[in-house]
Interface confidence: low
């Protein structure tokens, strides 16, 4: 009946016009559909041009929906990153401020004449946390070696101590432990704490980066066809009230987002590793305890040096010979100031606990983000049928959708009835992002064991002996340059989106 056919085109006119397209494209009454390339070729209210316009629009709408979902996740990760980064930086800044406020009174010139060395140490710890390509153990070793030379000179102003004597002092120091247990303790605890903190924050950065990059992956032409058929073909075929069958929608989106679903395994691994490493934030070697109390180890070290001064001097003279007396120099420094130690255990502020529990909950919520995308988009962005199964749009007509729902990921789309997916051609951007996830997971797993992956096996003799615990007192027998207190490699592992001098971002 021509009248009913022309009536059905009225609804298409309404939808088509609402999308901003010209109504002059829309036929007054249904026409034969041999020209249709995507929709089934029955009687239709859509011309070729309309079909093409609607296909492009449905494609754009799906990409927008995909970006919206990704943006929510990205925002969550970015917020987490900022919160943790602020907290960790705050801990270190607090420690440095305490040092600057208390050390002049506690140690007098022993501190004031070496303030630059302490400042440089904090700068290097900050750089390391932010991802600089520093070897933390070496950084600490060089700090102690430099400090020992300078303090020894200050404690013995009456002696002439040329460079070769100071080199000998450095070699003796390993056995003498002039700073007591503090350097070793600080090294062991700081390495684990800083590695854990920086890898966790880097993990958040990488996760956010992956989401951003994957959201930009274009949907292929086969997906466009399938989404057009899913969303608008019912209108073209005169069944505009029929909503898509849920399983039909899922199959279309599983086909369209097949590559994205392949992120699932490595995404879960990354989030698991991130949740796991938060275990390293607590206890005496935990992030909060260690980063916030670096100054107490430094105070302990200077006190130990002063306490051991006479024994140390005797042993150094034994090993290195009698140094010449400086005729211009004053007598030996007798006034000793002993720095009163602040309690090493910082009372937990509760901030980190709150941050971690929130992060754990949110990371758990987004674990299945990639495989749940088809379901999420179908249920949230599509007006799916809730009517009985045989009344929904199945891609051909109103009726039951019979094919089974495909599994997740590229390999499972081999028989997807809705989207022709070439399972032999994975998307390269997504493969690269899978690799980034894998790489970051490796870093976190190493960090969990207290290792910094960038410096595993980086021993000077090239013997591949692990992360190396060879120095008894963090003072290995090495010459230390007295020229510069901070000749460091620039950032090469910067955290994404954090520092002004970012170096090279992880991608």
């Amino acid at each position: 009946d021509p009248a009913s056919k022309s009536r059905s085109c009225g609804e298409v006119r309404q939808i088509y016009g609402a999308k901003g397209f010209s109504l002059s494209d829309v036929p007054q009454a249904e026409i034969s559909g041999e020209h249709l390339r995507i929709c089934p070729q029955g009687y239709t209210c859509c011309t070729s041009e309309m079909e093409e316009n609607l296909a492009n629009r449905s494609h754009a709408e799906l990409e927008t929906a995909l970006r919206d979902s990704s943006r929510v996740l990205q925002a969550m990760l970015a917020t987490q990153l900022r919160s943790f980064d602020d907290h960790f930086q705050h801990l270190l800044n607090d420690s440095e401020r305490t040092l600057q406020a208390t050390f002049p009174g506690a140690f007098g010139e022993l501190y004031t004449q070496n303030a630059r060395a302490f400042r440089d140490l904090y700068s290097e710890l900050r750089l390391y946390y932010r991802g600089a390509n520093l070897h933390l153990e070496e950084t600490l070793a060089e700090f102690w070696a430099r400090l020992l030379e300078r303090l020894f000179k200050q404690l013995h102003p009456q002696l002439l101590l040329p460079d070769d004597y100071l080199d000998c002092l450095g070699k003796q120091a390993e056995a003498l432990r002039p700073f007591g247990e503090a350097p070793r303790e600080l090294r062991l605890r700081a390495t684990r704490a800083f590695v854990a903190a920086r890898s966790f924050v880097q993990g958040l950065g990488v996760a956010s980066d992956v989401v951003r990059k994957v959201a930009q992956v274009p949907l292929g032409p086969e997906c466009s066809r399938a989404v057009m058929k899913l969303v608008y073909c019912a209108h073209c075929l005169g069944v505009p009230g029929a909503r898509p069958c849920p399983d039909y929608c899922r199959n279309v989106l599983k086909g369209c987002l097949a590559n994205q679903a392949d992120l699932d395994a490595e995404w879960r691994n990354l989030l698991d590793s991130m949740v796991l490493i938060t275990d390293k934030f607590w206890g005496t070697s935990g992030v909060e305890s260690v980063i916030g109390s670096v100054h107490t180890w430094l105070a302990e070290a200077i006190n130990a040096l002063q306490d051991n001064r006479d024994t140390l001097t005797a042993k150094v003279i034994q090993g290195c010979g009698n140094p010449k007396v400086n005729p211009q120099g004053p007598g030996p420094e007798e006034k000793r100031r002993r720095g009163k130690l602040a309690p090493r255990e910082r009372p937990p502020s509760g901030t980190l606990e709150k941050l971690v529990s929130e992060a754990k909950a949110q990371l758990r919520d987004v674990q299945d983000f990639w495989i749940s995308l088809p379901g999420t988009l179908c249920s949230e962005k599509m007006a799916l049928s809730t009517a009985s199964d045989d009344r929904c749009w199945n891609g051909m007509a109103r009726g039951r959708y019979l094919p089974e729902v495909m599994g997740d990921g590229l390999a499972n789309q081999i028989n997807n009835p809705e989207v022709e997916v070439d399972i032999t051609k994975p998307d390269m951007t997504i493969r690269q992002q899978i690799m980034q996830l894998k790489i970051m997971t490796n870093r976190l797993r190493s960090a969990y064991n207290g290792n910094d992956v960038d410096f595993q096996d980086a021993s000077d003799d090239g013997s591949g002996s692990g992360s190396g615990d060879g120095c008894l007192d963090d003072l290995c027998s090495r010459k230390v340059s007295r020229k510069s207190s901070s000749s460091r490699t620039p950032l090469t592992h910067a955290l994404p989106g954090l520092s002004e001098q970012e170096g090279q971002k992880t991608s």
């Epitope: 991802g131 390269m428 493969r431 690269q432 899978i434 690799m435 980034q436 894998k438 790489i439 490796n442 797993r445 096996d457 980086a458 591949g464 090469t492 592992h493 910067a494 170096g503 090279q504 971002k505 992880t506 991608s507």
Partner: antibody, heavy 127, light 106 residues
Framework: AVTLDESGGGLQTPGGTLSLVCKAS????????MFWVRQAPGKGLEFVAG????????LYGSAVKGRASISRDNGQSTVRLQLNNLRAEDTGTYYC????????WGCGAYSAGDIDAWGHGTEVTVS | ALTQPSSVSANPGETVKITCSGG???????YGWYQQKSPGSAPVTVI????KRPTDIPSRFSGALSGSTATLTITGVQVEDEAVYYC??????????FGAGTTLTV
């Protein structure tokens, strides 16, 4: 001691298929990434293909992309390179190389900067 | 490709530095240095992962990475160090790349 033994080289015909095998011993094969690198006569080193420890990722140099396939058998400690549609410019010495870093506790990169041991090479002539 | 000088020369006992730049910029910059004494002979790794040295390589060979430039340093170069040195890294798509080689003449 680490040993990497390449085999399968020799005279090949243009348009044909090359199949090289590298047999590894002296280290935990299943924990490391493996690469094939080649060197044309009088030229420098060129990355051909790479595969990670559990064969999750395979990587190919631009000159062989679409023609090469790298695979590994961790049970046999072998890595294989297949190169189809051979050309004269595929002539050269093909080296098998291992990296020290496993992907489980990795050094964080899939890089020709990771190579810590090389095979002696197998010569391939396409003519 | 990676950029390295085509040749350097030195007298025995001198210190030689060879630079290499242009590796992948994602922040995981790893460089290796490979010595080849004659064409067709197998390369030998002298440095991998920027600064690691295989156990059988003399301590006069060292590596460092500063920014995105890797440097191979041979302190007290010897006649037997004469060779072509290739640096290796990767591009931004993770594909391995090598420099064209630096001929060291002692």
């Amino acid at each position: 001691a680490v040993t990497l033994d390449e085999s399968g080289g020799g005279l090949q015909t243009p348009g044909g298929t090359l199949s090289l095998v590298c047999k590894a011993s002296g280290f935990d094969f299943s924990s490391v990434n493996m690469f094939w690198v080649r060197q044309a006569p009088g030229k420098g080193l060129e990355f051909v293909a790479g595969i990670d420890n559990d064969a999750t990722f395979t990587l190919y140099g631009s000159a062989v992309k679409g023609r090469a396939s790298i695979s590994r058998d961790n049970g046999q400690s072998t890595v294989r390179l297949q190169l189809n549609n051979l050309r004269a410019e595929d002539t050269g010495t093909y080296y098998c190389a291992k990296t020290l870093c496993s992907t489980t506790w990795g050094c964080g990169a899939y890089s020709a900067g990771d190579i810590d041991a090389w095979g002696h090479g197998t010569e391939v002539t396409v003519s | 490709a990676l950029t390295q000088p085509s040749s350097v020369s030195a007298n025995p006992g001198e210190t030689v530095k060879i630079t290499c730049s242009g590796g992948g910029s994602s922040g995981y910059g790893y460089y290796g240095w490979y010595q080849q004494k004659s064409p067709g002979s197998a390369p030998v790794t002298v440095i991998y992962n920027n600064n690691k040295r295989p156990t059988d390589i003399p301590s006069r060979f060292s590596g460092a990475l500063s920014g995105s430039t890797a440097t191979l340093t041979i302190t007290g170069v010897q006649v037997e160090d004469e060779a072509v040195y290739y640096c290796g890294s990767r591009d931004n798509t993770y594909v391995g790349i090598f420099g064209a080689g630096t001929t060291l003449t002692v």
